[in-house]
């Protein structure tokens, strides 16, 4: 896969993943009422990071925000923080990667600068994805723990009615947001890795020149290690010079004609 394609695809995958992280963070269905093996109620409860909702069989849905910070479980606060950090890093990663894209020309930015920016955005996306995955996993673990705890005391006997009165504890299971979060985090992570791989292709390396076969020419030719389809950055005066068909070619470069990657 060409460097630009890898970089572009990494950007798109990261962007989709990032959108998913935002969606997951905003969704109300982080945990949903467990309906399996439970007395069937005409009320369905579900909870998000920011509010809890109740949907009645009547169709009426009521959502209440968590208006307290101090009263919330530390784990929920931690998950919120992880998701927000993931979003913030994602935003920075997107901004950086836009400038780093090889297909976008910004001033006289050379490829080594673009390579550094690509690597930076890749790392940001990787951390963003990891934050989302950890956040969702922490919440999922919290749900599993609470699920089994509430299963253990599913029915707690109460004093009234001769001890026959029972109170049903609502159990919660994985909501749609968890799956969205896992997938989105994974995509952002993959996109970040692709950006880092693309960065390797943008970075000039001494070993690249060993594979270049030079065709003698007295004319002013810009020799480029075609395997990376990028300027070496050793002199900006090569930017606008003509690339001849018989110019520098690497062993892995199949094309003899100028390509869209030859001009930045």
């Amino acid at each position: 896969m060409s460097v630009t394609a890898c970089q572009g695809l990494g950007f798109v995958v990261s962007l989709i993943g990032f959108a998913g992280i935002i969606a997951a963070t905003c969704m109300d269905q982080w945990s949903t009422q467990d309906l399996y093996n439970n007395p069937v109620t005409a009320v369905f409860n579900y909870q998000g990071l920011w509010r809890s909702c109740v949907r009645e069989s009547s169709g009426f849905t009521e959502c209440r925000g968590y208006f307290t910070l101090l009263g919330l479980p530390a784990m929920l606060q931690a998950v919120r923080a992880l998701m927000i950090v993931g979003i913030v890093l994602g935003v920075i990663g997107i901004l950086v990667s836009i400038f780093a894209l090889k297909c976008i020309r910004i001033g006289s930015m050379d490829d080594s600068a673009k390579a550094k920016m690509t690597l930076t955005s890749g790392i940001l996306f990787i951390i963003s994805g990891i934050c989302a995955i950890i956040g969702v996993s922490v919440f999922a673990n919290m749900l599993v723990t609470n699920f089994w705890m509430s299963t253990a005391n599913m029915y707690s006997g109460m004093g009234g009615m001769g001890g026959m009165v029972q109170t049903v504890q609502t159990r919660y299971t994985f909501g749609a947001a968890l799956f969205v979060g896992w997938v989105a985090g994974g995509l952002t992570l993959i996109g970040g890795v692709m950006m880092c791989i693309a960065c390797r292709g943008l970075t000039p390396d001494d070993s690249n020149f060993k594979a270049v076969s030079y065709h003698a020419s007295g004319q002013n030719v810009a020799y480029r290690p075609g395997g990376f389809k990028a300027s070496t950055g050793f002199g900006s005066n090569t930017r606008n010079k003509k690339i001849y068909d018989g110019g520098a070619r690497t062993e892995d470069d199949e094309q003899s004609h100028p390509t869209k990657y030859d001009y930045v």
Epitope: T41, A42, S58
Partner: antibody
């Protein structure tokens, strides 16, 4: 305003069936559940079941499974309840009602008296 | 099924006096998600369909006189008529609106003493 108009009284023979209708008006029929309630003469209220007219989904009281079949026709905004294999204990007033906040029944039909007699 | 038990079965109260009807459920009708009790009170007069009075155990339906009030939580609920009027003579039902199948109390017949 919301209105539920039920079909008229019926006198049926034991073993036969009857289909009671409930025509809704004044609201979006598909958006609200329709419930059916039985009231035997001089007795209390008994919930039979419900239908979601939008999806056609139903939920029955176990006691009435096999006895009552609830359907809905969105094109005419009408809900139906069919009672099969009628017996004398099926003699009652049957009400349709539309749900409201808290799953309560705010709007009721006028009731349909079904008399099962040989 | 949830059993709803009303008491008393019948009640005679003088005009202008307070009438209190109790309703107990075999399971808590309190939903933890919104801290609301899914209990409804209805009034039924002879030859008429039931009329919604109170839902969510204590929320009065619009158009219902403010002499009617509902209270209670979990399994114990109360309907109170602060000052009985002649038109309040009827049978009152409580209903579980939380668990399927929805179940009604046996009814309390309110009369004037």
């Amino acid at each position: 305003q919301v209105q539920l108009v039920q079909s008229g009284a019926e006198v049926k023979k034991p073993g036969s069936s009857v289909k009671v209708s409930c025509k809704a008006s004044g609201y979006a029929f598909s958006n609200y559940l329709i419930e059916w309630v039985k009231q035997a003469p001089g007795q209390g209220l008994e919930w039979i079941g419900l239908i979601n007219p939008g999806s056609g989904g139903t939920n029955y009281n176990e006691k009435f499974k096999g006895k009552a079949t609830i359907t809905a026709d969105k094109s005419t905004s009408t809900a139906y309840m069919e009672l099969s294999s009628l017996r004398s204990e099926d003699t009652a007033v049957y009400y349709c009602a539309r749900v409201y906040y808290g799953n309560s029944f705010a709007y009721w039909g006028q009731g349909t008296l079904v008399t099962v007699s040989s | 099924d949830i059993v709803m038990t009303q008491s008393p079965d019948s009640l005679a109260v003088s005009l202008g006096e307070r009438a209190t009807i109790s309703c107990k459920s075999s399971q808590s009708l309190l939903n933890s998600g919104n801290q609301k009790n899914y209990l409804t009170w209805y009034q039924q007069k002879p030859g008429q369909p039931p009329k919604l009075l109170i839902y969510w155990a204590s929320t009065r339906e619009s158009g219902v006189p403010d002499r009617f009030s509902g209270s209670g939580s979990g399994t114990d609920f109360t309907l109170t008529i602060s000052s009985l009027q002649a038109e309040d003579v009827a049978v009152y039902y409580c209903q579980n609106d939380y668990f399927y199948p929805f179940t009604f109390g046996q009814g309390t017949k309110l009369e004037i003493k």
